[in-house]
Interface confidence: low
């Protein structure tokens, strides 16, 4: 396999390339629909209640045929709309040009309205961060799109959870879709403007507030549900901002809008690095140190209730999901790969295809175990045992399953559990699970994980090839399952 496999998907490359697929491919399986829980206020009396997403529980058989019918129905009902199923989200730079990207250019958002829907999905883009003048200068040279709006395209195609195609997005295809590009490099936490002293503005938290303010004039004021979603740094941004958005809407006179969060690949651990390195750049700097420095540099803000739990100067704790989550008031659904590539990157784990030493194998397995532990009290969670990064705006986000349930279905169940008829009930809905965390102990032990490609040959690898390539000894992997290595290989090869 040439110089070996590099399955590590650096966020910087992922976002630099502009593609959301990176170097992963996704196996298409019989598509499975939507899901999720926690409690919220019922709509005000007299308000029309928008129907919930289709409940696919009864649809056992041919999902493709069912989806084709749904799409055909949707298309036949759509011609009266000027949008004509146009997938594009259109760029709107903020009218308040003082709320800016790092370089002082106005921040903005991409919007695709769905006039019949009272659901709004606001998605926060990810893409690492920078935390001092030196690495921000470097970022500006190499990833300007993540620091400036000057070269943003006029439109973007909505993919995954941002898609308006029911077969690609069985969860919320009919929602109003908003994509907020990440151009503040501050994990959506900053509140400082560009000045003589500050070469860069860091206004992530203010950008979210301003986008919400402007969307109120574009129909958000009539929303029933606002789902603040995000991937990677955007996922952490959700945890940092969801309560503030709810508070903002309350203060502006819209207390009936139910604000929820969906944090994808933003639930990081402040664990011990596999190999400690000095805080030289964004990738090698230990997350705690990077965030500690970043907060000061960005004038970063964290959720008030979390901040009060920590000493001054210790606000960095609130960037870590398992610490901030218990302080949040809004319901949040957490999506996290158990073996997240960004987590491994900051932990200085680089998988090159050389045989993995036992120490590293144990480290990786322990990471999955720790991650799983932090999710045990998160009622709404989806954590497959895969080595990957980000999922919700990938086109094939419907493919991965945990315990037989796909992410869109889990989100649908979550919606149902938050609906007013269940708000007093703490028991999960029958046949509609929302706490879905893989229990198998090693990367890609879940056969629905996205397929890995060899970085050098471009060839797909099945799970067995991948594990052997990573240096996992099949005997070690098979033993805890009570299987012979040959049996396990057969099962994995068949995708069972």
């Amino acid at each position: 396999m040439g110089r070996g496999v590099r399955v590590l998907l650096l966020l910087s490359l992922l976002h630099c390339a502009g593609g959301s697929e990176g170097r992963k491919t996704w196996r298409r399986r019989g598509q499975q629909p939507p899901p999720p829980p926690r409690t919220e206020a019922a709509p005000a009396a007299g308000q029309p209640v928008e129907s919930f997403p289709l409940d696919f529980t009864a649809v056992e058989g041919n999902m493709d045929s069912f989806m084709a019918q749904v799409k055909s129905l949707a298309q036949s009902l759509y011609p009266c709309s000027a949008q004509q199923l146009n997938e594009d989200l259109r760029l709107h730079l903020l009218l308040n040009t003082s709320v800016t990207c790092n370089d002082g250019s106005p921040a903005g958002y991409y919007l695709k309205e769905s006039r019949g829907s009272r659901r709004w999905l606001l998605f926060l883009e990810g893409g690492w961060y920078c935390f001092n003048r030196e690495n921000c200068d470097s970022r500006y040279d190499t990833m300007r799109r993540l620091m400036s709006s000057r070269d943003w395209p006029r439109t973007r195609t909505g993919t995954g959870i941002l898609s308006s195609q029911p077969e690609e997005n069985p969860y919320w295809w009919n929602a109003n879709m908003v994509f907020i590009p990440y151009c503040s490099s501050d994990v959506w936490s900053g509140a400082s403007s560009k000045s003589e002293k500050n070469e860069y503005a860091f206004m992530g938290a203010l950008i979210i507030q301003e986008v919400v303010r402007e969307l109120l004039g574009r129909g958000l004021s009539g929303a029933k549900v606002l789902l603040l979603a995000g991937s990677s740094a955007g996922g952490t941004g959700v945890l940092l901002n969801v309560d503030r958005v709810a508070e903002q809407l309350e203060k502006l006179g819209y207390p009936a809008i139910q604000v929820r969060g969906l944090a994808d690949s933003g639930w990081f651990l402040d664990n011990k690095q596999y190999r400690h390195t000095d805080c030289v750049d964004t990738i090698t700097c230990a997350p705690t140190e990077a965030i500690r420095r970043g907060i000061r540099y960005w004038n970063g803000v964290v959720p008030e209730r979390c901040r009060r739990q920590f000493q001054e100067g210790e606000e960095w704790n609130c960037f870590f999901g398992y610490k901030v989550y218990p302080t949040l008031r809004c319901p949040v659904f957490v999506v996290q790969w158990l073996f997240d590539e960004a987590q491994l990157t900051v932990d200085n784990v680089h998988l090159t295809g050389q045989p993995v030493q036992e120490g590293l194998r144990l480290y990786i397995q322990n990471l999955g175990r720790e991650l799983r532990h932090t999710l045990k009290d998160v009622p709404a969670s989806f954590a497959p045992a895969c080595l990957s990064h980000e999922i919700i705006i990938r086109s094939h986000w419907t493919d991965v399953q945990v315990k037989g349930t796909s992410l869109p279905r889990a989100l649908h169940c979550w919606d149902r559990s938050l609906h007013d008829s269940h708000k007093a009930s703490k028991t999960p809905l029958k046949g509609c699970p929302v706490h879905l965390v893989d229990s198998c102990p090693w990367p890609h032990c879940n056969p629905s994980c996205p397929t890995v490609r060899d970085q050098f040959t471009g060839q797909e690898m099945n799970v067995a090839q991948f594990l052997m390539h990573m240096g996992f000894d099949m005997q070690t992997v098979a033993q805890p399952q009570g299987l012979e290595p040959s049996e396990l290989l057969g099962m994995l090869s068949n995708g069972s």
Partner: antibody, heavy 121, light 109 residues
Framework: EVKLVESGGGLVKPGGSLKLSCAAS????????MSWVRQTPEKRLEWVAT????????YYSDSVKGRFTISRNNARNTLYLQMSSLRSEDTALYYC??????????????WGQGTSVTVSS | QAVVTQESALTTSPGETVTLTCRSS?????????ANWVQEKPDHLFTGLIG???YRAPGVPARFSGSLIGDKAALTITGAQTEDEAIYFC?????????FGGGTKLTVL
């Protein structure tokens, strides 16, 4: 009721030193940033210094940097301003003010009644 | 050092709406300048009214509101009352220091 009471002002010669105190009551002192602000004889307000709630971070105006030191004793609910190398332009009424945090927009909501400092030979 | 400029004096009548503004020499005032508005009444009685551009301090009457108007911070008194006659100072935060404006003397006739 929130109360801030400054003390320690007086007449001092140029180059001299003075230590101002501000006794706080009626709120959780250790949860708030605190500032010193002065009002010049011409009635202009000038911000002097701010200290963070735990005392870890201090900010000073350029005009006093290196000469004044802001500090606090959270156990005693007291804010201090140690002034040295005083100049005639430091003559002013000195106020301590309570600040909200970022979520309150750093609002300087409560002010003391002021203590007078005169620097003159 | 940045300079913060306010109207030196304004006059209004009881029940009228009046707006005071606060300009920065460095350019447009944004929310991250955390514009503060402080009221001074006779006998050196200072009260903070507004922080963070539009956050009204507890106990401050609802007729006082803060906002951004164009490139300036603004304090609006909707339905001014005679007791609102005072000097109003604005302060802007420049990342590591506050700068106060010269104050606006508001007369309510």
């Amino acid at each position: 009721e929130v109360k801030l009471v400054e003390s320690g002002g007086g007449l001092v010669k140029p180059g001299g030193s003075l230590k101002l105190s501000c006794a706080a009551s009626g709120f959780v002192f250790s949860s708030h940033d605190m500032s010193w602000v002065r009002q010049t004889p011409e009635k202009r307000l000038e911000w002097v210094a701010t200290i963070s709630s735990g005392g870890s971070y201090n900010y000073y105006s350029d005009s006093v940097k290196g000469r004044f030191t802001i500090s606090r004793n959270n156990a005693r609910n007291t804010l201090y301003l140690q002034m040295s190398s005083l100049r005639s332009e430091d003559t002013a009424l000195y106020y301590c003010a309570r600040q909200g945090d970022r979520y309150d927009g750093y609002v300087m909501d409560y002010w003391g009644q002021g203590t007078s400092v005169t620097v003159s030979s | 050092q940045a300079v913060v400029t306010q109207e030196s004096a304004l006059t209004t009548s009881p029940g009228e709406t009046v707006t005071l503004t606060c300009r920065s020499s460095t350019g447009a005032v944004t929310t991250s300048y955390y514009a503060n508005w402080v009221q001074e009444k006779p006998d050196h009685l200072f009260t903070g009214l507004i922080g963070g551009t539009n956050y009204r301090a507890p106990g401050v009457p609802a007729r006082f509101s803060g906002s951004l108007i164009g490139d300036k911070a603004a304090l609006t008194i909707t339905g001014a009352q005679t007791e609102d006659e005072a000097i109003y100072f604005c302060a802007l935060w420049y990342n590591n220091h506050w700068v106060f404006g010269g104050g606006t003397k508001l007369t309510v006739l």
